[in-house]
Interface confidence: low
């Protein structure tokens, strides 16, 4: 014969435990029902009556099966530099994340406590590492043969255009200016030929993913131990 199914509340076997979604009430010394998410324990169980659950009030929640006497308060409304990515409901807390162009400078268990605006790289500097949800943009000086003429949190250093005849040489913050004959950019995606004579012996490719800079235009090593870049003389 199958074992008799016990209904809450019931006394557990000596040394035994309560079942899933039940808890052991020390006062009643019985296994009692937990309340489902979105509810809380309005009346605790006794030896003869089970837990009485009630719905969470507005702006409060419980996310798990529980036997708390009061629901948790939802977090305060999102600040002006944040967007609400999860509303406060009876079953989940409000989650605030940083709006586009910002990153989380101080996180909390869920969402973000403090947002900060992504830094903008000024002319002569390009993005070495793009901003993420939790980290700021990292800028780098544009290496010889590359430039950035913008103040931007997304623009990388771009290669100077290659001229048949240069009218004004490029620098870190300005593209080269060619004479009236058309420039030759020779820019297959991901491959740029720097004007000579620019040594790229010790310059390594950027560790960040696309959009990629030209090989040899970054002063950053790939993150973590790695062999020298292909063609490096290692001097």
């Amino acid at each position: 014969l199958p074992a008799q199914v016990a209904f809450t509340p019931y006394a557990p076997e000596p040394g035994g435990t309560c079942r899933l979604r039940e808890y052991y009430d020390q006062t009643a010394q019985m296994c009692c029902s937990k309340c489902p998410p979105g509810q809380h324990a309005k009346v605790f169980c006794t030896k003869t009556s089970d837990t009485v659950c009630d719905s969470c009030e507005d702006s409060t929640y419980t996310q798990l099966w529980n036997w708390v006497p009061e629901c948790l308060s939802c977090g305060s409304r999102c600040s002006s530099d944040q967007v609400e990515t999860q509303a406060c409901t009876r079953e989940q807390n409000r989650i605030c994340t940083c709006r586009p162009g910002w990153y989380c400078a101080l996180s909390k268990q869920e969402g973000c406590r403090l947002c900060a605006q992504l830094r903008k790289c000024r002319p002569g500097f390009g993005v070495a590492r793009p901003g993420t949800e939790t980290s700021d943009v990292v800028c780098k000086p544009c290496a010889p043969g590359t430039f950035s003429n913008t103040t931007s949190s997304t623009d990388i250093c771009r290669p100077h255009q290659i001229c048949h005849v240069v009218a004004i040489p490029g620098n870190a913050s300005m593209d080269a200016v060619c004479t009236s004959t058309s420039p030759t950019r020779s820019m297959a995606p991901g491959a740029v030929h720097l004007p000579q004579p620019v040594s790229t012996r010790s310059q390594h490719t950027q560790p960040t993913p696309a959009p990629s800079t030209a090989p040899g235009t970054s002063f950053l090593l790939p993150v973590g131990p790695s062999p020298p870049a292909e063609g490096s003389t290692g001097d």
């Epitope: 101080l106 830094r119 790289c121 590492r129 990292v138 000086p141 040594s199 310059q203 002063f219």
Partner: antibody, heavy 119, light 106 residues
């Protein structure tokens, strides 16, 4: 006020590892990187590596096999560890702040911690 | 790596004298940085991005240069300028320093 303070062991046995902690105040490690530079009479100022504000490290190729740099943003601490020390690693070790925003100057330095490698 | 060669290694100047020290790079760099260090002190940022004076640096200092040739100039030497000056580049890894120019007061 921006401050960086290195704390190290002073004396290290040959072939042992060196651990230094750089404790910072007056700024957040989520916005600034931290360099490690050493200075010895024989070699002058020598850059070892840095940890960026986003937590990723860059190492000098000369030290990449025996150096690790980590940090704990919440404790405002940067951790430097170098393995297999020899006598020529005797130097003053500095941590210095990097402005990840673009000036790229090491604008604040710690007072340095003197490390002697000797048995 | 990019090697920075500073010259002269040692120089002395009288108060009021114009001083120029140079830093030559083994290959082209985008910017040069200069640091001042006095005995028993940490290096201090002095000039950044080739020509910008760090906070608190007197206006008698200036920096210039491009490509592989850079210089630091003091228009009128003062006693407090006696120190060792290091150039530094970060166009490519590793970041490198020059061996320094020690400037003494006559």
């Amino acid at each position: 006020e921006v401050q960086l303070q290195e704390s190290g062991p002073g004396l290290v046995q040959p072939s042992q590892s060196l651990s230094i902690t750089c404790t910072v105040s007056g700024f957040s490690l989520t916005s600034y990187g931290v360099h490690w530079v050493r200075q010895s009479p024989g070699k002058g100022l020598e850059w070892l590596g840095l940890i960026w504000s986003d937590g990723s490290p860059d190492y000098s190729a000369a030290f990449i096999s025996r150096l690790s740099i980590n940090k704990d943003n919440s404790k405002s601490q940067v951790f430097f560890k170098m393995n297999s020390l020899q006598a020529d690693d005797t130097a003053i070790y500095y941590c210095a702040r990097n402005d990840d925003g673009g000036d790229y100057v090491m604008d604040y330095w710690g007072q340095g911690t003197t490390v002697t490698v000797s048995s | 790596e990019i090697v920075l060669t500073q010259s002269p290694a040692l120089m002395s100047a009288s108060p009021g004298e114009k001083v120029t020290m140079t830093c030559s790079a083994s290959s082209s760099v985008s910017y040069m940085y200069w640091y001042q260090q006095k005995p028993r002190s940490s290096p201090k940022p002095w000039i950044y991005l080739t020509s910008n004076l760090a906070s608190g640096v007197p206006a008698r200092f200036s920096g210039s240069g491009s490509g592989t040739s850079y210089s630091l100039t003091i228009s009128s030497m003062e006693a407090e300028d006696a120190a060792t000056y290091y150039c530094q580049q970060w166009t490519s890894n590793p970041l490198t320093f020059g061996a320094g120019t020690k400037l003494e007061i006559k």
